[in-house]
Structure formats: C-alpha cells, structure tokens
Interface confidence: low
Amino acid sequence: HTDLSGKVFVFPRESVTDHVNLITQLEKPLQNFTLCFRAYTDLSRPYSLFSYNTQGKDNELVVYKERVGDYSLYIGRQKVTFKVIEKFPAPVHICVSWESSSGIAEFWINGTPLVKKGLRQGYSVEAHPKIVLGQEQDSYGGKFDKSQSFVGEIGDLYMWNSVLPPEEILSAYQGTPVPANILDWRALNYEIKGYVIIKPLVWV
C-alpha cells in the first residue's frame, strides 16, 4: 500500500493497454457508496473515469464522461446522466454517491451538488470487483476500447461504503477527506499496466 498524497497517475496517451488496477478487499455487496477523485484532461470525446466490474457483470459501477458538461453514472448497467456548466479544459473534483434504499445518486463537481437522480433502488453493487482507471472494462478486468480510454491525470481518489454528508464531500474537495475504507489515496494498493506514470499533483 502506497501513500500517493500530492501525486497523480498520468495517462499520457490514447491506448487500449494503459491502465491502473485498483486493488481492494471488498468482500460484501455495496448498498451505499461515495467515490471522490480529481481529474484533469483535455479530451472532448467520451471516456471512462472509473470502471468497476464484477465477474460476469459489465458496467456494475462506472463513472463516464459523455461530453463536456455531461457525466454519467452506471449502477448495475443502468445509467443516469448529470449536467453541469463547466470550463474546458479545466481540473475537476468529482464526488458521486449512491444509496440503494432510495436509489438516489448525487454528483458533486468542485464542491457543488448537481441535480439528484435516481436509479436501481434496492439494488446491491456486487463485491469482489476489478477496478480500473484509464480504460473502460467490457469484461472482468479487460476488453478495453481505445475510443473510451482516458488521457490525462487522476488523483486524490477515495471510496467509502457510505453516503458522505455534504460537509464531508466538501472536506474531500478541500483536500482533507475523512478516512476511506474501500479505496484510500493515502494507502492505495494498485498495479500499473502499460504507460502510466506517477507525477506530482501541480494543478490544485
């Protein structure tokens, strides 16, 4: 496990190979979660920001950028899209949360909440995932598509097994997140595959 505070993964080129596997011991299904991270890219085409697949289940949990101003969240292969007015290109801090009991999904961009959406009420996100940054999985840990690959920088990634209250979302945005128990940038277990470089975070 590595403390990546003040660092980012740089994905320098479009590819079908370059990615980072995030390793977690998630042993029970998720009925709530919050995921936060920072990203910086000048891509205008669609791309995957966070891809979580389980055995035999594609798009179990995906954060996907459709186009400038449109972010999508997939839970169990269902999708909702969030709209935001944003500068391009510009660094962004993204938090997304989902609560199974209500189905409510929340998206926060740079500490500001977007209009809430609903999907997959009562569903449980399966455990034992393959989590990939830099590519969109179409199978369990593989089947990548160059046209959906991420080119840019990702850092400060945290994932909790709960829906964080607004003040904790803001803490994450401000760089002081509460401890995260699924993925924690300060104690991250990861595996770099291909051309991905760790560099200092210089754009926050």
Partner: antibody, heavy 119, light 107 residues
C-alpha cells in the same frame, strides 16, 4: 511474525521532552500507517496521531498537534513519537499500533511504554 | 470530536452468560467502528472491525453489530479468559476516538 517492539519506560521532569521508539518487524514497514495511542493510568485510550512511513505524511489529533512529533527511520523500520513540554497529566502508557491494510482499525500493537512525568 | 459513549461502564457476569456492551456515537460514523479487548498490563487486541467483522483468530462467540450511531458487542457465552476491559473506537472521522471502556468482571 508481525511485531512492534517499543522502547523502555521513562521518567521525565515537567517541561522536558520524551521520545518513544517503536521497531517494526515481520512486515513491510513502509506499506502501513503507524498510529500512536496513549492511556493514562486507570483511564481509556486516546489517539495521538498517525504517520505513513513511505511518504512521512502525518495526521495529528488537534489536542497534540503543537507538542507531538511523529517521525520514522525507514532504514531501521522504526517509528518515533516525541512529546514536548511534558506535564504531569502526560503520565501514561504510550502505544504504537499498525493500521490494518484495508480497514481503519489497529491490528497490531506494541507492548506499550510507560512515561512518568514527575518533579 | 465524535464522542463514543459506552455502557455499562462495568459489568459483573458469570461463565456461560450472554453479555452485551453498547456504544453510542455522538454523530453518524457509518459502520466504521472497531472493538478491542484489553487485559491489565497488556496492549489492546482487535476483536471486531467494520462494526461486524471478526478479526482473524477471534472466537465466534464474539460478534458485533450496528451502523450509524448505535453499536453492540455481544459475547454469546462467557469464558474465563473473556474477563477484561472492552473499548469501542470510531474510525470514521479525525481524530479517531474511543469509548471510555467497559470492565467485565467475574460475578
């Protein structure tokens, strides 16, 4: 096996400093957060702070921020906790504890170091 | 800081008894609670993490439950070696905080 071995008991004067060591063995020292917790005689447990040996990133309990300093020596797999401006209420057993590699709890503890502050 | 209030502060019980210790957090801590056992002159030992998961090697008579603000440690059938002090700990927010402890004594 995984072990944390702490330095021996200390008797200190009020106003002085103490530095407690914690030597890790049986695991990769630089991969786990190290925490420090204290326990006054007959009292409960109090979290002081934590340090990641790889980056030397720290996080302190606000109560101790001005007086506690956490450091590591990677070459000897040893963590240190220094507490300055000691007062009688700092008399306690000081523990180092390793954070589990996934969940935020302490899975391995040192045996404790008794620090007595007395004039 | 989040306060963790344990009850009772002390408890007398007999071998074979079922014992329940509760811990109440002053605000939501999700399932980020651990339980430790401490014997006199010794360091604490992890029993339960993430509210309900037993640490490796911990006997099955120990179980944990709860989420949000209310948590419980249950010992289904007390054994002689279980007489000790038990602490809950929240690890949801900095600073991490502990309950004041529950001393379990032989009746």
């Amino acid at each position: 096996q995984v072990q944390l071995v702490q330095s021996g008991a200390e008797v200190k004067k009020p106003g002085s400093s103490v530095k407690v060591s914690c030597k890790a063995s049986g695991y990769t020292f630089t991969s786990y957060w190290m925490h420090w917790v204290r326990q006054a005689p007959g009292q409960g447990l109090e979290w002081i702070g934590m340090i990641h040996p790889n980056s030397v990133n720290t996080n302190y309990n606000e109560k101790f921020k001005s007086r506690a300093t956490l450091t590591v020596d990677k070459s000897t797999s040893t963590a240190y906790m220094e507490l300055s401006s000691l007062r009688s209420e700092d008399t306690a057993v000081y523990y180092c504890a390793r954070r589990n590699d996934y969940y935020w709890y302490f899975d391995v503890w040192g045996q404790g170091t008794l620090v007595t502050v007395s004039s | 800081d989040i306060q963790m209030t344990q009850s009772p502060s002390s408890l007398s019980a007999s071998v074979g008894d079922r014992v329940t210790i509760t811990c109440k957090a002053s605000q939501n801590v999700n399932s980020n609670v651990a339980w430790y056992q401490q014997k006199p002159g010794k360091a604490p030992k992890a029993l339960i993490y993430s509210a309900s998961y037993r640490y490796s090697g911990v006997p099955s008579r120990f179980s944990g439950s709860g989420s949000g603000t209310d948590f419980t440690l249950t010992i289904s059938s007390l054994q002689p070696e279980d007489f000790a002090t038990y602490y809950c700990q929240q690890c949801n927010n900095y600073p991490f905080t502990f309950g004041q402890g529950t001393k379990l004594e032989i009746k």
